[in-house]
Amino acid sequence: GVFNYEAETPSVIPAARLFKSYVLDGDKLIPKVAPQVISSVENVGGNGGPGTIKNITFAEGIPFKFVKERVDEVDNANFKYNYTVIEGDVLGDKLEKVSHELKIVAAPGGGSIVKISSKFHAKGYHEVNAEKMKGAKEMAEKLLRAVESYLLAHTAEYN
């Protein structure tokens, strides 16, 4: 079956700068700023656009080894990034895949809001438990905070 879920996280970084760093340059930046979570991101095929496959290797101490993602759409104008987790122990034995739409919007008082809409595709009649969703949200938040800290410390970058 399918389970729809969404979450949002505020950031002090403006939308354009956050998208440029966290999304467009995330493959390089995230392993650099959060090596305790992700050790490497490798583009297996494609140039970063739709159809690109990324192999993400987690750091030691993280309960997952790797994840394989497929890029479905990159919308630079609207700060939107669509991708699907298609493989990896992160899916466990109950999930077939998970599609995410990450959208960064300007926040009214400055900064931005990172919105993630997810579609969990479970195998057969399996239910998607709340822990799985909470875990995904916490992981994304941890990476976002690491990027945020880096950007606050390196004000000349990604402008």
Partner: antibody, heavy 122, light 108 residues
């Protein structure tokens, strides 16, 4: 403007097959999931099936699983519902409906066709 | 599956009156993933509300949606003659996507 036009309904005997078509226009078809929803005479709405924007994912309601197959042709902006082993309880108006959210979809329906009536009777 | 129970089954009201329609879910609807549709005789349903409270394009502001826990409400502030119809709620949090059995708003 968004338009969905169903066709292919009619009277069919139990156990036989039928193929419904849904012709879409007025939106970027290849970016939206499409659903089939049916309504038995005098009854409420029942979700039947969905096909993802790229045709990779297909899901069905329990009452039609294993008998109905949904497919799409993005080049023709068409969606089809192949109905096999039809039963009298499949008698209904069948609507195709556009998902309200692009790409992965959110599974609510912002535009509906006018419906096509399928009558399963001996 | 998530079961949606609508009440009342029939709501007899006069034009100008306020209509309050209820939809109760058998389990939690995360992210307010609930929609409302209007259906008139021999017509297709029409989306009114999604996300429990967001009005769809072109829907007049006399239609509003709200939620409290697993209880969802569609309110029509002042009934117009064209509002007499059947109303359905639908959840889209987990498949199979399910509808309530409908509430008929009829002229008293």
């Amino acid at each position: 403007q968004v338009q969905l036009v169903e066709s292919g309904g009619g009277v069919v005997q139990p156990g036989r097959s039928l193929r419904l078509s849904c012709a879409a226009s007025g939106f970027t078809f290849s970016r939206y999931a499409i659903h089939w929803v049916r309504q038995a005479p005098g009854k409420g709405l029942e979700w039947v099936a969905v096909i993802s924007y790229d045709g990779d994912d297909k899901y069905y309601g329990d009452s039609v699983k294993g008998r109905f197959t949904i497919s799409r042709d993005n080049s023709k902006t068409m969606v089809y519902l192949h109905m096999n082993s039809l039963r009298t309880e499949d008698t209904a108006v069948y609507y195709c409906a556009k998902d309200g959210y692009s790409l992965y979809g959110k599974d609510y329906f912002d535009y509906w066709g006018q419906g096509t009536l399928v009558t399963v009777s001996s | 599956e998530i079961v949606l129970t609508q009440s009342p089954g029939t709501l007899p009201l006069s034009p100008g009156e306020r209509a309050t329609l209820s939809c109760r879910a058998s389990q939690s609807i995360t992210n307010s993933y609930l929609a409302w549709y209007q259906q008139k005789p021999d017509q297709a349903p029409r989306l009114l509300i999604y996300g429990a409270s967001s009005r769809a394009t072109g829907i007049p502001d006399r239609f509003s949606g709200s939620e409290s826990g697993t209880d969802f409400t569609l309110t029509i502030s002042r009934l117009e003659p064209e509002d007499f119809a059947v109303y359905y709620c639908q959840q889209y949090v987990r498949s199979p996507w399910t509808f309530g059995q409908g509430t008929k708003v009829e002229i008293k």
